[in-house]
């Protein structure tokens, strides 16, 4: 907390400019009007303030807006955003995607901080659902964002948003998350033809039930082993040797390299040896 002292004669700030970097902390506190700061927030980022000076500026804004900053100020916080605590951010009402982008840009290249997580949470809750534009923005900054959400949070993703999801966005998703996302993807891509559908749905197949895998096996999709390894164990176990052969097509030979790994190991174990032998891969049940 900076002590309240009178502003020295002639030092009262008329605007936010570079001269302020020479002000001591107490001078900033005494000589910079909070309302002026709020209206000229966009200038703060162009001025090389020290961390200590930024603390003073934040303190002034906190005093001016004890219930939380208005979006007009939030959008121009820039590096001052890094000074905000999750508690500060919980007071905000961020509705503009441009504001969200501006603040994410400040944190770009770093892992998701508690501040950013709180900001995103506030934004998404304010919108009521994770729409396509928001998802596009978030996954651009944080490819792992989708997989950081709980299954309950993912249930608010409308099928239309699924079009924004790239394969790499699902890399760290676990089965419970894919269980939620797969039916949405199936709905989103339902009007596509066979080969195009498979290209789009492939990343989501970790949530597919047995009957959908059986249906895919009839469509000459040639699923690669990496995708097969991500399938649910309970969905793979009931597949016959013939169905797996059709599902994988020329990639079926890859089963040999994965025979000690789940779910391939579990599937092999439950097949008749005579059926496995038809693959000619030397798989032992």
């Amino acid at each position: 907390e900076v002590e309240k002292t009178a502003c020295p004669s002639g030092k009262k700030a008329r605007e936010i400019d570079e001269s302020l970097i020479f002000y001591k902390k107490w001078e900033l506190e005494a000589c910079v009007d909070a309302a002026l700061l709020a209206t000229q927030m966009d200038r703060v980022n162009a001025i090389p303030f020290t961390y200590e000076q930024l603390d003073v500026l934040k303190h002034k804004l906190d005093e001016l807006y004890p219930q939380g900053y208005p979006e007009s100020v939030i959008q121009h916080l820039g590096y001052l955003f890094l000074k905000m605590s999750p508690e500060d951010i919980r007071k905000w009402n961020v509705t503009s995607l441009e504001t969200l982008k501006a603040l994410l840009e400040v944190n770009k290249g770093h892992e998701m901080s508690p501040q950013v997580a709180t900001l995103i949470d506030r934004f998404v809750k304010g919108r009521g659902q994770l729409d396509k534009d928001t998802l596009d923005t978030l996954t651009a900054f944080y490819p792992g964002y989708l997989c950081s959400l709980s299954p309950e949070e993912l249930s608010s993703v409308p099928p239309s948003s699924i079009w924004a999801v790239r394969p790499q966005d699902l890399d760290t998703c676990d089965p419970r998350q894919l269980d939620v996302l797969y039916p949405k993807a199936r709905l989103a891509f339902q009007n596509m033809n066979g080969s195009e559908y498979f290209v789009k749905i492939q990343s989501f197949l970790g949530g597919a039930p047995t009957e959908d895998l059986k249906a895919l096996s009839q469509q000459n999709v040639s699923m690669d082993l990496a995708t097969f390894m991500k399938l649910r164990t309970d969905a793979v176990l009931p597949l016959t040797v013939a169905e797996v052969q059709k599902l994988l097509g020329p990639h079926v030979e890859g089963l040999k390299a994965e025979e000690r790994h789940r779910p391939v190991r579990d599937w092999i174990l439950r097949q008749r040896q005579d059926d496995l032998d038809t693959l000619g891969l030397g798989l032992q049940g």
Epitope: D174, P175, M229, R260, H261, R262, D266, L269
Partner: antibody
Amino acid sequence: QVQLQESGPGLVKPSETLSLTCTVSGGSVSSYHDLWSWIRQPPGKGLEWIGYIYYSGSTNYNPSLKSRVTISVDTSKNQFSLKLSSVTAADTAVYYCAREDALTGFDIWGQGTMVTVSS
Amino acid sequence: DIQMTQSPSSLSASVGDRVTITCRASQSSRYYVNWYQQKPGKAPKLLIYAASSLQSGVPSRFSGSGSGTDFTLTISSLQPEDFATYYCQQPYDASYTFGGGTKVEIK
């Protein structure tokens, strides 16, 4: 409610073969989803998986014990068994049998039986 | 074989504390990691399977996360009955390895 019960001698001489049986009650050893494992825990130490068997007779063993281990299943008696040959004092441990549901993990365990290797 | 390294090997905590135990696999085990709790003289009990799924009957204060090589077991608010040893285990590779265990003791 599936329950498992280990049985067998509590004392085995060095160089002999340790033999234990696990009896499955309240369920079937022939269950489609389940694998039946043996796991051991030396006194004051951590858990070591020994191997599993499927009702079809297919087995999988810990590579470090493979040369000495045999696990078998008797579906008519609803039992599976462990044989560990050429034992030494290092094989002294609590031996557990456990069911592994392919979709979860070792969800049901026996209460364990202490086997001491000593002359 | 995939080696599982747990840390810390022991920790002291108080009732109500948030406790985090980590497990690192020597190579990817995807999301195939299970967590067990063992009390002295008793058989282990399955808490979490497939990295983050809560086993039926296990209190919701237990949660798991992670994929690939890094996994975490979290107890959100430690209860008196939670003082025990915790083990991670990977069933992805056929070698079925366990971590060395983490003993959670009363501070």
